[in-house]
Interface confidence: low
């Protein structure tokens, strides 16, 4: 059977539905792909990614991913489907409103990731969920 | 159903010039970084150049900058490469592939079917 | 740059054997390592990606498996279609570099 939050429309593609019955839209996220990224022991730091992309599918979230290893930072940003691990984790928080960072294992490296459900949220990150977003010591993310 | 088909190799002299199309379908191209891979005859692959989604960056492998330039063509669904001042050791079969951002979906995939340059006099 | 190195360079093996390829880098890249399969006049097909990802439509008998500086494709079950050469790739910097291959024959 197919779930309530979900119908089948007749061309076979998936209309996707809020809840409620709405039809969900495709949302909007920052979508650079990876850039190195100066964001460093910060609470918070801005993409600074310029391209907002309508994303591709209805279910689609936000997804901004932090690295750092010994050559440099890069911060990703990419819209994703929730239903599917991205860099092999599962998008445990994609419900979210905004983009809390939380660490991940990966051997030889420091990696967070996080994900959110709600337009251009990840062009903030957020390390800290005390954080103040009215905070102006922000770092922002140099282009390569 | 994705296809990237690549056209413009061909033979030229040592210093010559080619530039090389990939013409994409099937998919938005507009959101995925893209790349060039070559194989020289009897070789291994070798990735050669990388451009963003946007066009706004560019990677080229040591042994072709300042001599092959990447380039895309979002409107029109394709991908460039021009080749200047060509070297034999440049002979190869040229493949254009999808991907290559410094992700976790960081790989090459799928893959056009390759077009022949050689580089002879 | 990283180098990926490979080994065998080539082997022969019979429809129906385990083969494996090792894959080894020069340095950590974590798991951010690539399969390829690659068939005479034909263009490079993915298989594996981040290490262990099948990448879709690839048959189960295919894996991929290690973390840091070696790695390796496993064919558990050879079956006639899959005699190729194959390549690793890490993609954890720039270049991405490809191993020298290796080449799958019959026996």
């Known amino acids: 059977t197919i779930p309530p939050h979900v119908q089948k429309s007749v061309n076979n593609d998936m209309i996707v539905t809020d809840n409620n019955g709405a039809v969900k839209f495709p949302q909007l996220c920052k979508f650079c792909d990876v850039r190195f990224s100066t964001c460093d022991n910060q609470k918070s730091c801005m993409s600074n990614c310029s391209i907002t992309s309508i994303c591709e599918k209805p279910q689609e979230v936000c997804v901004a991913v932090w690295r750092k290893n010994d050559e440099n930072i890069t911060l990703e940003t990419v819209c994703h489907d929730p239903k599917l691990p991205y860099h092999d984790f599962i998008l445990e928080d994609a419900a979210s409103p905004k983009c809390i960072m939380k660490e991940k294992k990966k051997p030889g490296e420091t990696f967070f990731m996080c994900s959110c459900s709600s337009d251009e949220c990840n062009d903030n990150i957020i390390f800290s969920e005390e954080y103040n977003t009215s905070n102006p010591d922000l770092l922002l993310v140099i282009f390569q | 159903q994705v296809q990237l088909v690549e056209s413009g190799g061909g033979l030229v002299q040592p210093g010559g010039s080619l530039r090389l199309s990939c013409a994409v379908s099937g998919f938005q191209f507009r959101r995925y970084a893209m790349s060039w891979v070559r194989q020289a005859p009897g070789k291994g692959l070798e990735w050669v150049s990388s451009i963003s989604a946007s066009g706004d960056r560019t990677h080229n492998t040591d042994s072709v900058k300042g001599r092959f330039s990447i380039s895309r063509d979002n409107s029109k669904n394709t991908l460039y490469l021009q080749m200047n001042s060509l070297r034999a050791e440049d002979t190869a079969v040229y493949f254009c592939?999808?991907?290559?951002?410094?992700?976790?979906?960081?790989?090459?995939?799928?893959w056009g079917q390759g077009t022949l340059v050689t580089v002879s006099s | 740059d990283i180098q990926m190195t490979q080994s065998p360079s080539s082997l022969s093996a019979s429809v129906g054997d385990r083969v494996t390829i090792t894959c080894r880098a020069s340095?950590?890249?974590?798991?951010?390592l690539n399969w390829y399969q690659q068939k005479p006049g034909k263009a490079p097909k993915l298989l594996i990606y981040?290490?262990?990802s099948l990448q879709s439509g690839v048959p189960s008998r295919f894996s991929g498996s290690g973390s840091g500086t070696d790695f390796t494709l496993t064919i558990s079950s050879l079956q006639p279609e899959d005699f190729a050469t194959y390549y690793c790739q890490q993609s954890y910097s720039t270049p991405p570099t490809f191993g020298q291959g290796t080449k799958v024959e019959i026996k």
């Open positions: 592939a999808k991907g290559l951002a410094a992700s976790g979906k960081n790989y090459f995939d799928p």
């Open positions: 340095q950590s890249i974590s798991s951010y």
């Open positions: 981040a290490a262990s």
